[in-house]
């Protein structure tokens, strides 16, 4: 039998070899598919409910206007030409549907080294036959049950359309000291050959290394954080870790838009500088660490206040990070 693959919903024409190009013709189509109990015989005369599913064209070919899952099976044609020579055609029809692009849902933004983590769930909807999902790390296939990799798979079939939804949940245990930003992707491989795999957009979770951390110290000058108007406050974030982490600053719990720096200098202090300051150290190998908060206050405030008074010489300096 000749193998034929047809996309679900598309038309299909099967040629009846040896049949005269136009009537009168002596030919017969026999079908054994999901729509038939055993063999169903179709003749050029046609008619009846089968015409909407499959009908014989004037040239003897069999025409299926929209192939469905139930049309998978064997199609045979037996034709006799004008000289009485008999020719048989035999087709094995399989149908397919390519799903939408797979997606990774519930993806983790951060993984912890040394312990199992759920990376995400890969979902492919609307395939036929089911096909398979596979995971990749930095472009290379991940093998389940190897090196801390485990995959939980689930296949569901739509009760009406018969199309498949595949789900694959990936769990990994990142090695300590490994790649801090691994790239994971997932691909759908169709069940029928000659169709290329569909790949998700990659995800790049951070890997956090749980290391016993030494505390981040915040030193304030002048000590106590109380300063006269126009004075200068210097905040220094001391982190014992090597290499030096990136230091960012917070005021009243809100990040300050400043370039990273271990020192924050507040010259020409004014009332709007009052508040609670802390620093956040971000290491490449583990998560952010916040210091204690220190309060900056103004002692003996002068007349300076909103629009009733001015700051600094010709303009208060903007905050600098040293």
């Amino acid at each position: 039998a000749q193998n034929i693959t047809a996309r679900i919903g598309e038309p299909l024409v099967l040629k009846c070899k040896g049949a005269p190009k136009k009537p009168p013709q002596r030919l017969e189509w026999k079908l054994n598919t999901g729509r038939t109990e055993a063999w169903k015989v179709l003749s050029p005369q046609g008619g009846g409910p089968w015409d909407s599913v499959a009908r014989v064209l004037p040239n003897g070919s069999l025409f299926l206007p929209a192939v469905g899952i139930q049309d998978e099976g064997i199609f045979r044609c037996q034709a006799m030409n004008r000289n009485g020579k008999e020719t048989k055609s035999n087709y094995r029809v399989r149908v397919y549907q390519i799903p939408g692009k797979p997606e990774i849902v519930d993806s983790a933004s951060e993984l912890t080294a040394g312990v199992p983590n759920k990376v995400g769930t890969c979902v492919s909807e609307g395939s036929y036959p089911a096909g398979t999902l596979s995971w990749h790390l930095d472009g290379k296939p991940l093998v389940p049950n190897e090196k801390g990799v485990s995959v939980k798979e689930q296949t569901r079939r739509h009760p009406e359309t018969g199309l498949f939804t595949l789900q694959s949940e990936l769990m990994v245990t990142p090695a300590r000291g490994g790649d801090p930003r691994p790239t994971f992707s997932c691909s759908f491989s169709p069940g029928l050959p000659r169709h290329r795999a569909l790949r998700t957009a990659p995800i790049q979770p951070r890997v956090w290394e749980p290391v016993p951390l030494e505390e981040v110290q915040l030193v304030v000058e002048p000590e106590g954080g109380a300063v006269a108007p126009g004075g200068t406050v210097t905040l220094t974030c001391e982190v014992p870790a090597q290499p030096s982490p990136q230091i960012h600053w917070m005021k009243d719990g809100v990040p300050l838009p400043l370039p990273p720096s271990p020192v924050l200098i507040l010259p020409e202090i004014g009332p709007q500088d009052q508040g609670t300051y802390s620093c956040v150290a971000t290491h490449s190998s583990h998560g952010p660490q916040e210091s204690r908060a220190v309060s900056i206050s103004i002692i003996e405030p002068g007349e300076e206040g909103p629009t009733a008074g001015s700051v600094g010489g010709s303009g208060l300096g903007t905050l600098a990070l040293a």
Partner: antibody, heavy 116, light 107 residues
Framework: QVQLQQSGAELVRPGTSLKVSCKAS????????IEWVNQRPGQGLEWIGV????????HYNEKFKGKATLTADKSSSTAYMQLSSLTSDDSAIYFC???????????WGQGTSVTV | DIVMTQSQKFMSTSVGDRVSVTCKAS??????VAWYQQKPGQSPKSLIY???YRYSGVPDRFTGSGSGTDFTLTISNVQSEDLAEYFC?????????FGAGTKLELK
């Protein structure tokens, strides 16, 4: 008094690079940030990025990443902005300005006109 | 990105008038807003920071107000030297953004 003195006007060919300087005086250079802003002919102001001269830390407007590189030399109290792969779209006046945390820009340079 | 909208591109005024230039932020920026004055061929001059604080040397006829998303620069008793373009700017979060400017002209 606080002053930010920028380098002079430049007329350059497309595809070339250019370094604009901003010399600070009258204050402690490392106590403040230096911001860079541009203004295309007849247009408004656009923030390019900021450098902390004390630490060398920088932050850029995404639009200018790869176009502008900010550096600072503490010994000469000078901030620099290098502009690369110049095109006619980069023709503008470039300003440096002093700023600090919790505050905006207070003093501005006189501007450097760049024509590509 | 936070968009700063100055809805009036031009405003007409007379010497001695009181005029208010407005600026609207697309999201809450607290009081992290500054106002700048720019005259043709000159660099911007800093007037107001933290929405309502005047820089030293700025005449007290310039007043800033507002918080959250709505900000106003008011010039009472407009002088001829105040005829210029005024820009608002947010410095609440990166990247910093400016309004498109409002030109103050004589009636």
């Amino acid at each position: 008094q606080v002053q930010l003195q920028q380098s002079g006007a430049e007329l350059v060919r497309p595809g070339t690079s250019l370094k604009v300087s901003c010399k600070a005086s009258g204050y402690a250079f490392t106590n403040y940030l230096i911001e860079w802003v541009n203004q295309r002919p007849g247009q408004g102001l656009e923030w390019i990025g900021v450098i902390n001269p004390g630490s060398g830390g920088t932050h850029y407007n995404e639009k200018f990443k790869g176009k502008a590189t900010l550096t600072a030399d503490k010994s000469s109290s000078t901030a620099y902005m290098q502009l690369s792969s110049l095109t006619s779209d980069d023709s503008a006046i470039y300003f440096c300005a002093r700023s600090r945390a919790v505050r905006a820009m207070d003093y501005w340079g006189q501007g450097t006109s760049v024509t590509v | 990105d936070i968009v700063m909208t100055q809805s009036q591109k031009f405003m007409s005024t007379s010497v001695g008038d009181r005029v208010s230039v407005t600026c609207k932020a697309s999201q809450n920026v607290g009081t992290n807003v500054a106002w700048y004055q720019q005259k043709p061929g000159q660099s911007p001059k800093s007037l107001i920071y933290s929405a309502s604080y005047r820089y030293s040397g700025v005449p007290d006829r310039f007043t800033g107000s507002g918080s959250g998303t709505d900000f106003t620069l008011t010039i009472s008793n407009v002088q001829s030297e105040d005829l210029a373009e005024y820009f608002c700017q947010q410095y609440n979060s990166y990247f910093f953004t400016f309004g498109a400017g409002t030109k103050l002209e004589l009636k």
